[in-house]
């Protein structure tokens, strides 16, 4: 079953996916595709990495996290209703039948009509993430980043902007908890 994520038309959508490299910089191939994870690779690939870098991507699809630490979360910029659907993150880990495959469901909602446009916020940069990862070694929890100096009004504004996101329920815990695997 897929984990569901939401974004509005015109926003950036964020689909989390992480692994723990066996050693710093010891990366493995990862692909993102539109459609559930198949047997080989990803279907309809939108982004692919190798053991060194991103080696294939299409417009609007980016990795904005720390790729070298195993953050291969996908950002889709300026989403449209056509971006709705299942996305596959596949981490091709060495060993026998070790691949991590995650199917994430992205739901795009029509943009809310507001009197004045609000500045887009990229919540991947605004909040720290507590993540439980599975990969080469045992699961571990790590915190990336720290809570920036923002006032309560900003937090309230962000909470409103993100209320349809799975992250919204965790704002009061001063960070979003994402558990994959």
């Amino acid at each position: 079953s897929e984990v569901e994520y939401r974004a509005e038309v015109g926003q950036n959508a964020y689909l989390p996916c992480f692994y723990t490299p066996a050693a710093p910089g010891n990366l493995v191939p990862v692909c993102w595709g539109k459609g559930a994870c198949p047997v080989f690779e990803c279907g309809n690939v939108v982004l692919r990495t190798d053991e060194r870098d991103v080696n294939y991507w299409t417009s609007r699809y980016q990795l904005k996290g720390n790729f070298y630490k195993g953050d291969v979360s996908l950002t889709i910029e300026n989403v449209t209703l056509a971006d709705s659907g299942i996305y596959c993150c596949r981490i091709q880990i060495p060993g026998i039948m070790n691949d991590e495959k995650f199917n994430l469901k992205l739901v795009i909602k029509p943009a809310k009509v507001t009197p004045a446009p609000t500045r887009q916020r990229d919540f991947t940069a605004a909040f720290p993430r507590m993540l439980t990862t599975r990969g080469h070694g045992p699961a571990e929890t790590q915190t990336l980043g720290s809570l920036p100096d923002i006032n309560l009004t900003q937090i309230s504004t962000l909470a409103n902007e993100l209320r349809d996101s799975r992250l919204a329920n965790d704002l009061r815990d001063s960070g979003a908890t994402i558990r994959i695997g």
């Epitope: 493995v28 191939p29 459609g35 559930a36 198949p38 047997v39 080989f40 690779e41 279907g43 690939v45 692919r48 190798d50 053991e51 080696n55 294939y56 091709q92 880990i93 060495p94 060993g95 026998i96 039948m97 070790n98 691949d99």
Partner: antibody, heavy 120, light 107 residues
């Protein structure tokens, strides 16, 4: 264009280990996008995927054979290998090595196949 | 594992006729279905992948359709070299599985 060639004994005794080699030319076995696979076809019957190995070291085996099969690779020789232990007459088949290419337009390359008979 | 059932088992047609082959999956395979052609003494040859995409070098007379559990391979006008066995294969779920094949023979 990638070419594959199977080699190994055509006759194996029951309970022994079947060992086959696939030699790849026209492409590097350590390049991404290719799933180096073994597939077999019992005489007059359908096809069965045995397993694959990817350049990352990711390996998948058919659950029906998992306890008996090993697929490995030697990048320096541009070869990959199949070992199937404790064979019986039911393992008599044409064994193909194949490469499924999934980057860009999907395509595949197959060896010509080698018949392995399990008999005493 | 996912079971693929092909029908008919044998199709007897003449050159120039249209061939329609069916493949049904025991559960949804989305669009992750391929069609292969195999001639006696040869390895299979990929014709169609992801239900409807022709592989490199495959003539336009071969087309595929369907999604979920029901798929069709159509050969619009049979050429003499098209008489062979055709297999469908899913790559939705491990292990990849093949149908039992449809033999297209000369009537």
């Amino acid at each position: 264009q990638v070419q594959l060639q199977e080699s190994g004994p055509g006759l194996v005794k029951p309970s022994q280990t079947l060992s086959l080699t696939c030699t790849v030319s026209g492409g590097s076995i350590s390049s991404g996008g290719y799933y180096w696979s073994w597939i077999r076809q019992h005489p007059g019957k359908g096809l069965e995927w045995i397993g694959y190995i990817y350049y990352s070291g990711s390996i998948y085996y058919n659950p029906s054979l998992k306890s008996r099969v090993t697929i490995s690779v030697d990048t320096s020789k541009n070869q990959f290998y199949l070992k199937l232990s404790s064979v019986t007459a039911a393992d008599t088949a044409v064994y193909y090595c194949a490469s499924l290419m999934v980057w860009g337009v999907m395509g595949d390359y197959w060896g010509q196949g080698t018949l392995v008979t399990v008999s005493s | 594992e996912i079971v693929l059932t092909q029908s008919p088992a044998t199709l007897s047609l003449s050159p120039g006729e249209r061939a329609t082959l069916s493949c049904r999956a025991s559960q949804s395979v989305s669009s992750y279905l391929a069609w292969y052609q195999q001639k006696p003494g040869q390895a299979p040859r990929l014709l169609i992948y992801d239900a409807s995409n022709r592989a490199t070098g495959i003539p336009a007379r071969f087309s595929g359709s369907g999604s979920g559990t029901d798929f069709t391979l159509t050969i619009s006008s049979l050429e003499p070299e098209d008489f062979a066995v055709y297999y469908c294969q899913q790559r939705s779920d491990w292990p990849p599985t093949f149908g039992q094949g449809t033999k297209v023979e000369i009537k």
